[in-house]
């Protein structure tokens, strides 16, 4: 490991928000990747343990891929014997940090994503306030989540062929975590924000979706002004 002599120090996690999913349950035959992105000076080394013991490629059929630049461990076509605790150990001469992930390999039937009942919930908000819609997704395989808003085009909610007009507000991307996708935040809402919102979750089996409505009310000052203007 190289020591630049500048800001020497113990290892630290560079993307801790990407490491919050400590329990990973995946169907058999899928690919699993554990990541422990870190930094330090000198640049730390990374090693992996399975159930507290050194983990090497020869320990599993199909081997493993250690991608040191990406601080990752990849296992393809996982089987039930891959279940266990996987620990990354990141260290340099100034210190050591570690993170443990638990892998469960599922053999049950994979299904369409299941969305928690009642979410997202209908919301009523005052003009200028902030709103959050929540969507909880259960899926055997990694789901991809999108938030859609139903819109009108020339006064119509659907196209000539019956296709609903929608705008994609939020979608899975390289810099979006699962937790972030489960929440749609609307700030300083306007009357144009009122309408139907849909949480759409898909996996390799198919899609599922739940919708909710946002009603936007005038601010209280506007209500008062309207009352005064209407009084005789």
């Amino acid at each position: 490991a190289e020591d630049t002599g500048v800001d020497t120090g113990a290892p630290y996690w560079t993307r801790p928000e990407r490491m919050d999913k400590k329990l990973l349950a995946v169907p058999a035959a899928n690919t699993v990747r554990f990541r422990c992105p870190a930094a330090g000076n000198p640049t730390p080394s990374i090693s992996w343990l399975k159930n507290g013991r050194e983990f090497r490629g020869e320990h599993r059929i199909g081997g493993i891929k250690l991608r040191h630049q990406q601080w990752s461990l990849v296992m393809e076509s996982v089987v039930p014997s891959d279940r266990g605790n996987y620990t990354c150990v990141v260290e340099n001469k100034f210190g050591s940090i570690r993170q443990t992930y638990t892998l469960d390999v599922l053999e049950r039937s994979p299904h369409r994503p299941i969305l928690q009942a009642g979410l997202p919930a209908n919301q009523t908000a005052v003009l200028g306030s902030d709103v959050e819609f929540h969507c909880k997704v259960y899926s055997d395989a990694q789901p991809h989540i999108q938030w859609l808003k139903h819109v009108e085009v020339n006064g119509s909610k659907v196209g000539p062929d019956g296709t609903p007009y929608v705008t994609v507000l939020k979608t899975a991307g390289a810099n979006t975590t699962d937790k972030e996708l489960e929440v749609l935040s609307l700030h300083n809402v306007t009357f144009e924000d009122a309408g139907e919102y849909t949480c759409l979750a898909g996996n390799s089996i198919g899609f599922s979706h739940h919708s909710a409505w946002l009603v936007v009310l005038p601010a209280e000052e506007e209500l008062v002004e309207a009352d005064e203007a209407g009084s005789v």
Partner: antibody, heavy 124, light 112 residues
Framework: EVQLVESGGGVVQPGRSLRLSCAAS????????MHWVRQAPGKGLEWVAV????????YYADSVKGRFTISRDNSKNTLYLQMNSLRAEDTAVYYC?????????????????WGQGTMVTVSS | DIVMTQTPLSLSVTPGQPASISCTSS???????????VYWYVQKSGQPPQLLIY???NRFSGVPDRFSGSGSRTDFTLKISRVEAEDVGVYYC?????????FGGGTKVEIK
């Protein structure tokens, strides 16, 4: 035109291997899950396997688990089915079919597009 | 696995007359999102299956309106209001809610 074209079928002896290909065109292949479905002569349809749009998730029918491997090369717009330890009961027409897309689409989320099929005969 | 059972095995229909095919699933196909994930296909001689109906009752694009799908949870029906000569083929139901995806055994529709 949206199209799927299977190839690689043929006559093979029991215990041998064969690799089927399915070339996709007319749509963004890398945004869709893909399936293999087979049909034995004079019989009904049997689902074989599915692979997610990025290849990270794969599921198989119990009848082929451990013998068949589904894979894809998104740079070549091609789906594959590697069939090992073939048995007489694997004799069938093998179809590839488009599965669920990666994002919002109106209409069915899969099995709207099928290839013409490729025949695999396992016989000694 | 979910078992899909189709009846009848075959059907001989006079042109212009209605036809009805039943399909029963061993488990409910009503999903948490309120949709029922049963699909219907027709397979004409020497061709791959063609999608007719998706999510219980939605006609796929280009499918004539004489085809309709209905049912709930575990019992499903495909109806052809007035059978035409071109409707000859084998009809299959399929559950699309979980893997392994499973098909009914098929119903052969013939013209009298």
């Amino acid at each position: 035109e949206v199209q799927l074209v299977e190839s690689g079928g043929g006559v093979v002896q029991p215990g041998r291997s064969l690799r089927l290909s399915c070339a996709a065109s007319g749509f963004t292949f890398s945004s869709y899950a893909m399936h293999w479905v087979r049909q034995a002569p004079g019989k009904g349809l049997e689902w074989v396997a599915v692979i997610s749009y990025d290849g990270s998730n794969k599921y198989y029918a119990d009848s082929v688990k451990g013998r068949f491997t589904i894979s894809r090369d998104n740079s070549k717009n091609t789906l594959y089915l590697q069939m090992n330890s073939l048995r007489a009961e694997d004799t069938a027409v093998y179809y590839c079919a488009r599965g669920a897309g990666r994002g919002y689409t109106y209409g069915p989320d899969g099995f709207d597009i099928w290839g013409q099929g490729t025949m695999v005969t396992v016989s000694s | 696995d979910i078992v899909m059972t189709q009846t009848p095995l075959s059907l001989s229909v006079t042109p212009g007359q209605p036809a009805s095919i039943s399909c029963t699933s061993s488990r409910s196909l009503l999903h948490s999102d309120g949709k029922t994930y049963v699909y219907w296909y027709v397979q004409k001689s020497g061709q791959p299956p063609q999608l007719l109906i998706y999510e219980l009752s939605n006609r796929f694009s280009g499918v004539p309106d004489r085809f309709s799908g209905s049912g709930s949870r575990t019992d499903f029906t495909l109806k052809i209001s007035r059978v035409e000569a071109e409707d000859v083929g084998v009809y299959y139901c399929m559950q699309y809610i979980e893997a392994p995806l499973t098909f009914g055994g098929g119903t052969k529709v013939e013209i009298k």
